[in-house]
Interface confidence: low
């Protein structure tokens, strides 16, 4: 009686179980009563990453330098190429199809989370008592100078973009 299901790494065709092609190889012809499944290795720029019955291998991903991409890991006949972003850029999505520059946090904003290859700089507004006077992809909001600890007084209040200005205390004669 012909089988209705096949073992792992086999597939059912014409009422018989044929072996699947191993990763890195594509199907050329199905097995018959007398012959084994015929498989061929994928070419240099192609891959198949599973046991399969595909008649075509998949093209390796192209890491397009115009999109800010470079090869992180070269593909093999069994694995796809992995792209990553050039220095100073991060992926626009999980699939990393193109890259954008890490953004800088403007004055008045500090870095909450530094950018990585896959996520952008996250900025936060400087709260009261903190400031940032630079546009930076690295600097956090800095606390206002404490004039008291230097035996000075505040001559000019700080803002989210400027530090306080300290000055000498008026001496009472």
């Amino acid at each position: 009686e012909p089988p209705t299901a096949c073992r792992e790494k086999q597939y059912l065709i014409n009422s018989q179980c044929c072996s699947l092609c191993q990763p890195g190889q594509k199907l050329v012809s199905d097995c018959t009563e007398f012959t084994e499944t015929e498989c061929l290795p994928c070419s240099e720029s192609e891959f198949l990453d599973t046991w399969n019955r595909e008649t075509r291998c998949h093209q390796h991903k192209y890491c397009d330098p115009n999109l800010g991409l470079r090869v992180q890991q070269k593909g093999t006949s069994e694995t796809d190429t992995i792209c990553t972003c050039e220095e100073g850029l991060h992926c626009m999505s999980e699939s990393c199809e193109s890259c954008v520059p890490h953004r800088s946090c403007l004055p008045g904003f500090g870095v909450k989370q530094i950018a990585t290859g896959v996520s952008d700089t996250i900025c936060e507004p400087c709260p009261v008592g903190f400031f940032s006077n630079v546009s930076s992809a690295f600097e956090k909001c800095r606390p206002w100078t404490s004039c008291e600890t230097k035996d000075l007084v505040v001559q000019q209040a700080g803002t989210n973009k400027t530090d306080v200005v300290c000055g000498p205390q008026d001496r009472q004669r």
Partner: antibody
């Protein structure tokens, strides 16, 4: 204050194409992704795609692939969305949206919208 | 694609009351969710990004929470200007997808 100013309303016949522009004031687009989102009457917002002004790289919603083209003119700080082979169900308000401080996908700044009506 | 489902479709609330809006993702989107407010004839306005970070200039009565597949937008004390439609957006993977919206109306 960042502003995105879009081109005016359009009326098109089925099968035609429409090109909507989106001009940024105050800052250059470079480094900030520009998303395009549409909203048919009474419907949810629908993301169409985005363009990376830094590289010109685009990512499209497969639903629109082949019909939508996003481009950018960095020197004019203007982004464009062209939709071809228009059908009646493309009648919608089309928005451009850009991110400034927060995150490249969660757009902070939006254009006022451009109504595109497709009717024979 | 990831489907974002918002509930309820309509929420009737009195001014000064608390409103809780829910958004569920069909798969894990980590904390990559944003919330938008939209009033008739206007473009959407970003309120919350990365699930819980309030955009600069947004009043403290708006707060976001959640991660993975379940997210919440809370408006602690509704003001007259808060009556609008609210959308969640997942920005974890392409295509970016919005929920169908929750209309917050005056009770």
């Amino acid at each position: 204050q960042v502003q995105l100013v879009q081109s005016g309303a359009e009326v098109k016949k089925p099968g035609a194409s429409v090109k909507v522009s989106c001009k940024a004031s105050v800052y250059s687009f470079t480094g900030y992704t520009v998303n395009w989102v549409r909203q048919a009457p009474g419907q949810r917002l629908e993301w169409m795609g985005l363009i990376n002004p830094y590289t010109g790289g685009t990512t499209y919603n497969q639903k629109f692939k082949g019909r939508v083209t996003l481009t950018i003119d960095k020197s004019a700080s203007t982004a464009y969305m062209e939709l071809s082979s228009l059908r009646s169900e493309d009648t919608a308000v089309y928005y451009c949206a850009s991110s400034y401080y927060s995150n490249p996908y969660a757009s902070d700044y939006w254009g006022q919208g451009t109504l595109v009506t497709v009717s024979s | 694609e990831i489907v974002m489902t918002q509930s309820p479709a309509t929420l009737s609330v009195s001014p000064g009351e608390r409103a809780t809006l829910s958004c569920k993702a069909s798969q894990n989107v980590h904390t990559r969710v944003a919330w938008y407010q939209q009033k008739p004839g206007q473009a959407p306005r970003l309120l919350i990004y990365l699930a819980s970070d309030r955009r600069t200039g947004i009043p403290a009565r708006f707060s976001g929470s959640g991660s993975g597949t379940e997210f919440t937008l809370t408006i602690s004390s509704l003001q007259s200007e808060d009556f609008a439609v609210y959308y969640c957006l997942q920005h974890w993977t392409y295509p970016l997808t919005f929920g169908q919206g929750t209309k917050v109306e005056i009770k």
